[in-house]
């Protein structure tokens, strides 16, 4: 653990109620294939514990979806995965729509310091998939 | 070799018959820019042969393929990604449908132990493209 | 640095004129989340300093997009990652058409030697965001 | 602890409009939408829309745009439905409801308010 | 819209039985589905959510199952207390759509 290998792997535990964009995340062997080693959750939301450059990557699907339901609606759903705190650090690290499409994934390197709390809004009515192997968001410390 | 580093990025090879959906692959420098190292294939599929936490990622394009031709099947096109040997251990990784795409990319965090086998399961009718810019399956041991 | 874990992250910086199809990009901590470690710009096209095994990764969003617009287009928009000088060692790593998308994201294994030039070719008239959450392209050393 | 509490029932004639009103106690009213959903006499459920009570966007179900309006007063930690051009038809309890952690999941209740249209 | 199709309409049951209520919902709802009880003269009060998630002070009598289509609420033991209209709801999606309700009485 002493080399910094910071890595997690979360699955959707819930949406937040409907003001909050929010997906709430859970990760831990007795739940599945998901786990944290290093980064840990507060409040369904990773925090990161060791600074760094990261590879974060996600994929998000879409429960109830087909090409025009994702089109049909007049608000395009988003997803965005950011810093949401310390408030001075918020950005937003990456950003995908889905366009007649019900699932996005990519990923990217970024930095991240001990204490940034990274969040994934999605924004729109439609609710993401909870199957483990259709949506889930991870982090991976790759140097310092 | 010791620190663990396996790594493996494959090409396709061919796809099954009509009732196998597994992707077949190969690998090795005089096929082009494929290759394993640590992996090995076993008649086509990816055998993990260190235990430990890797990077899994894919993409698989549809050789003939417009925006249509994805969405008037009446099934759609999926990928899935999954461990289907030694049956105690068979699970689904990943998965993506084409909803009006003709590519699917993703990659995620997932514990794997020697001997566990990867299957890429592509359903539907469509065919993936053998171009190795368009279709390549990979995977990356990231720590123990 | 000795370790070898040269890496990257790059924003897009302009596209060029008509006629030539590579992305310029960008990096440095001055212009926010991208970052340079080991690899270098040459006339915003990013060449390895380190031979190895890399992860490469890319997302692109289309500027002003919808389903639409990337349909109606005859000559579709592509996205192609590749080798592009020295000219011995030409070739295209990673390929993916927007097909009713406005964003592609993909990630690949590839050796990649010292003083390859990597280009990102995108063809078509649509243009990419420059957000730098929607826009980005970077490598990582992975193994020798 | 959290607490909506909708104004009495009302009787009215057809073309009247009424405005049933649902304060709220024992959160921030911002933090949360708040939904509204009928229920005419011995039938089931109906979600009618919510309102964004930071925003104040309202959403409608269809059936429900037009003579239905939701409101709010912030600072009274207050939602309103408005019905106009009543009709015999939209007879029914209306009940404001709210989530707690998950989407669409409805925790709080209001007490319900029974609209009676008839002439 | 999500059509869902709740039955029976009507049962009744004896204090100590085992009660079962079916959903079924016009397409997948990927577990997105939850149960309320009303009393007569009462607001509605949530059972069940994500279909099988007990709420916070419910007894463990009560339990849902399901998955895609098909969901099920069930109460192990009637009690006296339990008498009321029980709806599904399923929450995937925009227009929230309800269940007709089944209303539970004693025998």
């Known amino acids: 653990e002493s080399l910094g290998w910071d890595i997690a792997e979360l699955q959707l535990n819930h949406t937040g109620p409907q003001q909050d964009p929010r997906l709430y995340w859970q990760g831990g062997p007795a739940l599945g294939r998901s786990f944290l080693r290093g980064p840990e959750l507060d409040k369904g939301q990773l925090r990161i514990r060791r600074d760094g450059i990261y590879m974060v990557h996600i994929q998000v699907t879409l429960a109830i979806c087909s090409s025009t339901s994702t089109s049909r609606h007049h608000h395009p759903t988003t997803l965005a995965v950011g810093i949401c705190s310390p408030a001075s650090r918020s950005i937003s690290l990456l950003r995908l729509s889905f366009h007649q499409g019900c699932t996005i994934a990519s990923q990217r390197l970024t930095p991240l310091a001990r204490g940034d709390t990274l969040c994934t809004n999605l924004t729109g009515t439609l609710l993401p998939s909870r199957n483990t192997d259709e949506t889930f968001f991870g982090v991976q410390w790759v140097r310092p | 070799e010791s620190l663990g580093w396996d790594i493996a990025e494959l090409q396709l090879n061919h796809t099954g018959p009509q009732q196998d959906p597994r992707l077949y692959w190969q690998g090795g420098p005089a096929l082009g820019r494929s290759f394993l190292r640590g992996p090995e294939l076993d008649k086509g599929q990816l055998r993990i042969r260190r235990d430990g936490i890797y990077m899994v990622h894919i993409q698989v394009t549809l050789a003939i393929c417009s925006s249509t031709s994805t969405s008037r099947h009446h099934h759609p096109t999926t990928l899935a990604v999954g461990i289907c040997s030694p049956a105690s251990r068979s699970i689904s990784l990943l998965r993506l449908s084409f909803h009006q795409g003709c590519t699917i990319a993703s990659q995620r965090l997932t514990p794997l132990a020697r001997g566990d086998t990867l299957c890429t399961n592509l359903t539907g009718t469509l065919l993936p493209s053998r171009n190795t810019d368009e279709t390549f399956f990979g995977v990356q041991w990231v720590r123990p | 640095e000795s370790l070898g874990w040269d890496i990257a992250e790059l924003q897009l910086n302009h596209t060029g004129p008509q006629q030539d199809p590579r992305l310029y990009w960008q990096g440095g901590p001055a212009l926010g989340r991208s970052f340079l470690r080991g690899p270098e710009l040459d006339k915003g096209q990013l060449r390895i300093r380190r031979d190895g095994i890399y992860m490469v990764h890319i997302q692109v969003t289309l500027a002003i997009c919808s389903s639409t617009s990337t349909s109606r287009h005859h000559h579709p928009t592509t996205l192609a990652v590749g080798i592009c000088s020295p000219a011995s060692r030409s070739i295209s790593l990673l390929r993916l058409s927007f097909h009713q998308g406005c964003t592609i994201a993909s990630q690949r294994l590839t050796p990649l030697a010292r003083g390859d030039t990597l280009c990102t070719n995108l063809t078509g008239t649509l243009l990419p965001s420059r957000n730098t959450d929607e826009t980005f392209f970077g490598v990582q050393w992975v193994r020798p | 602890q959290v607490q909506l509490v909708q104004s009495g029932s009302e009787l009215k004639k057809p073309g009247a409009s009424v405005k049933v009103s649902c304060k709220a106690s024992?959160?921030?009213?911002?933090?949360?939408?708040m939904n509204w959903v009928r229920q005419a006499p011995g039938q089931g459920l109906e979600w009618m829309g919510w309102?964004?009570?930071?925003?104040?966007?309202?959403t409608y179900a269809d059936g429900f745009t037009g003579r239905f309006v939701f409101s709010l007063d912030t600072s009274a930690s207050t939602a309103y439905l408005q019905i106009s051009s009543l009709k015999a038809e939209d007879t029914a309890v209306y009940y404001c409801?709210?989530?707690?952690?998950?989407?669409?999941?409805?925790?709080?209740w209001g007490q319900g308010t029974l609209v009676t249209v008839s002439s | 819209d999500i059509q869902m199709t709740q039955s029976p309409s009507s049962l009744s049951a004896s204090v100590g039985d085992r009660v079962t209520i079916t959903c079924q919902a016009s397409q997948d709802i990927s577990n997105y589905l939850n149960w309320y009880q009303q009393k007569p003269g009462k607001a509605p009060k949530l059972l069940i959510y994500d279909t099988s998630r007990l709420h916070a002070g419910v007894p463990s009598r009560f339990s849902g199952s399901g998955s895609g289509t098909d969901y099920t609420f069930t109460i192990s033991s009637l009690q006296p207390e339990d008498i009321a209209t029980y709806f599904c709801?399923?929450?995937?999606?925009?227009?929230?759509?309800f269940g007709q309700g089944t209303k539970l009485e004693i025998k």
């Open positions: 309102i964004n009570t930071y925003t104040g966007e309202p």
């Open positions: 409801a709210r989530e707690e952690d998950y989407r669409y999941v409805f925790n709080y």
């Open positions: 709801q399923q929450g995937v999606t925009l227009p929230l759509t």
């Open positions: 024992g959160y921030t009213f911002t933090n949360y939408g």
